[in-house]
């Protein structure tokens, strides 16, 4: 999916008004210096698609946080400000059921919650520049 | 500049068909859910379908669900509404719209100019 | 199906005054994850509609600062902080939480 076309001032503040406290929740009792970030991101489409990445592509590692209540957040968000990238509106009831069968976090999933903050802080800090 | 042009509009006599077309322009069709909604004579708005961007989800009022049936071609940027059983109650100006699914939580940002159907004998 | 009430019916306003619209639906709009899927029209005279506001408080491209929306849940308004002669015209609401999307009645605000 190509990002270019999404409002991203208001994805912005979605993300600081829910979807960066539901990542903060996920982390807690964790320090942001337990993890190196290593993933990053050079401009507000392209640190999209990595978040997207991050957020829903499974990895052998970490195979559940699309079931996560950030990830469902974040895709409503996307599909909310982004033309034509979910054709129908996210609903939070079966994410919520969905959330609550599986509780088990995985220090590597931790981990990609970490990379998930910082390319979040990018993508705000290239709308700050671009203002 | 952002453009939705209604053609097909007319008279038609009860129980008669039509088919209504919208050609889009200025924008990618593709991203973009659509809706018709249409306006009898001094009366209110009235929603009729919305098709989502990819054709997956497709919706009708029941004043015209089994009568009317909405499409679309992406790759010609145009949007139809085909009108069968026609009823005097049908009689309206009706209106191609952008919008009605997930983006901007389905307002209609787009408006065309309008058709007339006019269902009489 | 959602019923939109709209209040008044018609509304006749000097230029300069403020001017509210009220729109009630028969159940929440809320959805799950925070936004209300309530929208504003404007039909002006011989014209297409025009989309106003969107989600309940968000300006539409190229309205004016002077038309805003609020409210919550079930009741919502339209405020115009000073009405211009241009803004003539009946005003819709909208829900599109489920289908059957369903429109207000429509209030025409007219000029004194």
């Known amino acids: 999916y190509d990002f270019t076309n999404c409002d991203f001032q208001k994805i912005e503040a979605d993300y600081l008004r829910t979807i960066s406290k539901d990542l903060i929740t996920y982390m807690s009792g964790t320090k942001s210096t337990d993890f190196n970030n290593t993933v990053s991101c050079s401009n507000r489409p392209h640190c999209l698609t990595e978040i997207q990445s991050l957020t829903f592509n499974p990895t052998p590692r970490c195979a559940s946080l699309a079931k996560e209540m950030f990830a469902r957040k974040t895709k409503a968000t996307l599909a909310l400000w982004c033309p034509g990238y979910s054709e129908t509106q996210i609903n939070a009831t079966q994410a919520m059921k969905k959330a609550r069968k599986s509780k088990v976090t995985t220090n590597k999933c931790l981990e990609q919650v970490s990379q998930l903050l910082g390319l979040w802080r990018r993508f705000i800090r290239t709308l700050l520049k671009k203002q | 500049e952002v453009q939705l042009v209604e053609s097909g509009g007319g008279l038609v006599q009860p129980g008669g068909s039509l088919r209504l077309s919208c050609a889009a322009s200025?924008?990618?069709?593709?991203?973009?859910?659509m809706t018709w909604v249409r306006q009898a004579p001094g009366k209110g708005l009235e929603w009729v379908s919305s098709?989502?961007?990819?054709?997956?989800?497709?919706y009708y009022a029941d004043s015209v669900k089994g009568r009317f049936t909405i499409s679309r071609d992406n790759a010609k940027n145009s949007l139809s509404l085909q009108m069968n059983s026609l009823r005097a109650e049908d009689t309206a100006v009706y209106y191609c719209?952008?919008?009605?699914?997930?983006?901007?939580?389905?307002?209609?940002?787009?408006w065309g100019q309008g058709v007339l159907v006019t269902v009489s004998s | 199906d959602i019923v939109m009430t709209q209040t008044p019916l018609s509304l006749s306003v000097t230029p300069g005054e403020p001017a509210s619209i009220s729109c009630r639906s028969s159940?929440?709009?809320?959805?799950?994850?925070?936004?209300?899927?309530l929208h504003w029209y404007l039909q002006k005279p011989g014209q297409s509609p025009q989309l106003l506001i969107y989600?309940?408080?968000y300006r539409a491209s190229g309205v004016p600062d002077r038309f805003s929306g609020s409210g919550s849940d079930t009741d919502f308004t339209l405020k115009i902080s000073r009405v211009e002669a241009e803004d003539v015209g009946v005003y819709y609401c909208?829900?599109?939480?489920?289908?059957?999307?369903?429109f207000g009645g429509g209030t025409k605000v007219e000029i004194k």
């Open positions: 989600l309940v408080s």
């Open positions: 159940q929440s709009l809320l959805h799950s994850y925070g936004y209300t899927y």
């Open positions: 719209t952008r919008g009605g699914g997930a983006y901007y939580g389905g307002s209609l940002d787009v």
């Open positions: 200025g924008f990618t069709f593709s991203n973009y859910g």
């Open positions: 098709i989502t961007f990819a054709s997956s989800y497709i």
């Open positions: 909208e829900q599109t939480l489920q289908t059957p999307y369903t």
